[in-house]
């Protein structure tokens, strides 16, 4: 066996993309490797070139079709292989049977916007991107707000246990700059994980009116 440790992890974005990361201690950076996808009940197969993302980690995206096309379902199984070139032949480094809807990671929410802002409150909305219609309303969200002098890691998480694409932030400080992020997760799938965080949305609360209680 190859010495050290290795890991092969893939996620389906619920529409037409499987993103994979393969890591192995001691593997050479210039090694040429690919991920091959062979569905059990589809006519297509797909390959992507693994590109280095860190010292011993490679990643690639299997693009299965147009971004919003529904290329896989809950009954599909895709056999995924990592193949690396060794001289004139390709060597198998990892194999897994991949159930797409058990291994979901959606795209980060997009189109964040301030709907309404006051001195102590801000209403923000967003949209989900490339999410399957199969989920219907079975999604949850986490949100966080960056306050001045704090880090994202310190920001408390706000959980929305339903498909609610807006939030009303309260108890904010007047005339203060904030940033806001949100992420999404389907309820389905044993190995499903949170999407990446959205791009941060910067907003500023209104100043308190002079001489008035607010």
């Amino acid at each position: 066996a190859v010495n050290g440790t290795s890991q092969f992890t893939c996620f389906y974005n619920s529409r037409a993309n499987i993103s994979c990361v393969w890591s192995q201690d001691g593997a050479l950076q210039d090694t040429s490797c690919q991920v091959h996808a062979w569905p059990d009940r589809r006519r297509w197969n797909q390959t992507c070139e693994l590109l280095p993302v860190s010292q011993a980690s490679w990643a690639c995206n299997l693009i299965l079709g147009a971004p919003d096309s529904q290329k896989l379902t809950t009954v599909d199984i895709v056999t995924l292989r990592v193949l690396c070139r060794e001289g004139v032949r390709w060597r198998v480094m990892a194999i897994q049977d991949f159930k797409p809807f058990e291994n979901l990671r959606l795209m980060a929410p997009i189109s964040l916007q301030v709907v309404h802002v006051e001195t102590h409150r801000c209403n923000i909305s967003w949209e989900i991107s490339q999410a399957s219609h199969y989920f219907e309303r079975h999604l949850e969200f986490e949100a966080r707000t960056l306050s001045p002098g704090h880090t994202w890691e310190e920001a408390p998480l706000l959980t929305l246990k339903q498909k609610q694409e807006w939030i009303c932030l309260e108890t904010l400080t007047p005339d203060t700059q904030y940033e806001f992020q949100v992420r999404v997760k389907p309820l389905q799938g044993e190995f499903t994980t949170w999407s990446p965080w959205s791009q941060p949305l910067a907003f500023r609360t209104k100043p308190a009116a002079l001489g008035k209680d607010t």
Epitope: G4, Q7, I95
Partner: nanobody
Framework: QVQLQESGGGLVQAGGSLRLSCAVS????????MGWFRQAPGREREIVAG????????YYDDSVKGRFTISRDNAKNTVYLQMNSLKPEDTALYYC??????????????WGQGTQVTVSS
């Protein structure tokens, strides 16, 4: 947690056959690929064969291709390694392992205790 228990090892003459079994208990057997590794004295643990969980796609090390066959019975939560045309160099402690993907590295998530296979010439 997943528990693995190998059986079927023993002493056999070169050219003979053995069938190893690995009984799996605990979490869902269906969610794991299964593999057989071996370790000879003073050598690294090395992968012999692997089988995926749903399509039963198999992998074999070049040294055992055409001689060994891995199979699984999901109803019995058991994985097998049929070893034919055994050679003295197949002598080793054979381990059953489970993980989410077949990997060439010996860092799989779950392991059995091993069963000894000795091939005499």
């Amino acid at each position: 947690q997943v528990q693995l228990q190998e059986s079927g090892g023993g002493l056999v003459q070169a050219g003979g056959s053995l069938r190893l079994s690995c009984a799996v208990s605990g979490r869902s057997f269906r969610n794991y690929v299964m593999g057989w590794f071996r370790q000879a004295p003073g050598r690294e643990r090395e992968i012999v064969a692997g089988i995926t969980q749903f399509t039963s796609t198999t992998y074999y090390d070049d040294s055992v291709k055409g001689r060994f066959t891995i199979s699984r019975d999901n109803a019995k939560n058991t994985v097998y390694l049929q070893m034919n045309s055994l050679k003295p160099e197949d002598t080793a402690l054979y381990y059953c392992a489970a993980d989410r993907s077949i990997k060439m590295t010996a860092d799989w998530a779950y392991w059995g205790q091993g069963t000894q296979v000795t091939v005499s010439s």
